[in-house]
């Protein structure tokens, strides 16, 4: 169905990290252009990326309005130079995306260790609370502000002289772990949202080793 020489988009895919959300699709257009619409279950469709030859559309501004809603996008195909043309049903050819619920599905970006401090047999590791593209009252919210107690972190650590690893968990952005006095440690952190069924964990942060930069702040 649809207009002659116009093909429907396919492989519609959501790419989302820390709520920065882009819809991608195929094919690269030949003599056609695309327009994207996005809606919650309300059916109030909003058009974006009008008559584009790109095969991606940044929908961040729409999904951050309510990250707990479930969204659907659809990609319309039009003949280049004749965007008023429609298919035999009186509508342009289109394809729907999978459903997307940002709060449940956006990937959590790679965390960053902000600082670490050792005092005797205690080591405190602080994870930077990254900003997202979600706004409230005009200001961007951090991951912690968006996810609250749903967000946790896992610390993986070992003595610099050993390969034996240990883990610790926190529901804040800080770890306080017992260490051997005088020993140097290497560690990395991973964000986790235990309540999720998909995209539960981020990638690991870069490994930090004590004694290399003496635990200064890294912003």
């Amino acid at each position: 169905s649809g207009t002659t020489n116009t093909v429907a988009a396919y492989n519609l895919t959501w790419k989302s990290t820390n709520f920065k959300t882009i819809l991608e699709w195929e094919p690269k257009p030949v003599n056609q252009v695309y327009t994207v619409q996005i809606s919650t279950k309300s059916g109030d469709w909003k058009s974006k990326c009008f008559y584009t030859t790109d095969t991606e559309c940044d929908l961040t501004d729409e999904i951050v309005k309510d990250v707990k809603q479930t969204y659907l996008a659809r990609v319309f195909s039009y003949p280049a130079g004749n965007v008023e043309s429609t298919g035999s049903a009186g509508e342009p050819l289109y394809e729907n995306s999978p459903e997307f619920t940002p709060y449940l599905e956006t990937n959590i970006g790679q965390p960053v260790i902000q600082k670490y401090e050792q005092g005797g047999t205690k080591l405190k590791v602080t994870v930077k609370d990254s900003f997202t593209l979600v706004r409230k009252n005009g200001t961007f919210l951090t991951l912690r502000q968006v996810f609250g107690n749903d967000l946790g972190y896992i610390l993986t650590y070992r003595k610099s002289s050993s390969s034996g690893k240990k883990t610790a968990k926190t529901n804040t952005n800080e770890f306080l772990i017992d260490v051997d006095k005088g020993e140097n440690y290497c560690f990395s952190v991973q964000a986790v949202i235990p309540s999720r069924t998909v995209n539960r964990k981020s990638t690991d942060s870069p490994v930090e080793c004590m004694g290399q930069e003496k635990g200064e702040f890294r912003e």
């Epitope: 169905s1 279950k41 309300s42 059916g43 729907n96």
Partner: antibody, heavy 118, light 107 residues
Amino acid sequence: EVQLLESGGGLVQPGGSLRLSCAASGFTFSNYAMSWVRQAPGKGLEWVSSISGSGDYTYYTDSVKGRFTISRDNSKNTLYLQMNSLRAEDTAVYYCARSPWGYYLDSWGQGTLVTVSS
Amino acid sequence: DIQMTQSPPSLSASAGDRVTITCRASQGISSRLAWYQQKPEKAPKSLIYAASSLQSGVPSRFSGSGSGTDFTLTISSLQPEDFATYYCQQYNSYPYTFGQGTKLEIK
């Protein structure tokens, strides 16, 4: 639990009017498109009309355009169908249904019977 | 308007049988198709949306498949409560249209 309760059906003469209501509960009403579907006695299902969550977008089947008006009051969690210039062929059970994205119909009311007869 | 044609119009089967109902669209509708079950004097109930996605709470013996113009609803092992009338519906474009229904009866 999603609940949809239609009311307002009854017997009306040809050319007359009725207003159907559908009271919704168990979900955030404004977050969903809603639809009316009808079923004539002993017949199949016929989609009649849909409305977006904001009320900004409305759609009708050709046979009711200009005669029926769908509307909603999100503050009252209620969907309406104003039916004017009724005809014998409008006789049916009218169902209200929740319609995610204005697409399929995932929850239905029990229906209200409209009979157009002299 | 897109015409939806179901077959067969009626079907007799026994509990435990595997049953398939087909629905054909007069033009391509991608996967924008839903299936409903209706029992006498009751409101329809949603079974399947997006051609193959099972509605929450619907038993897994129900499944849907197809894309484009040809679709099927399969009940893998009929239960006594499954005897009803089944309808397909396209939501590719307005006006949305239903198939004429398939009445599933006890043999």
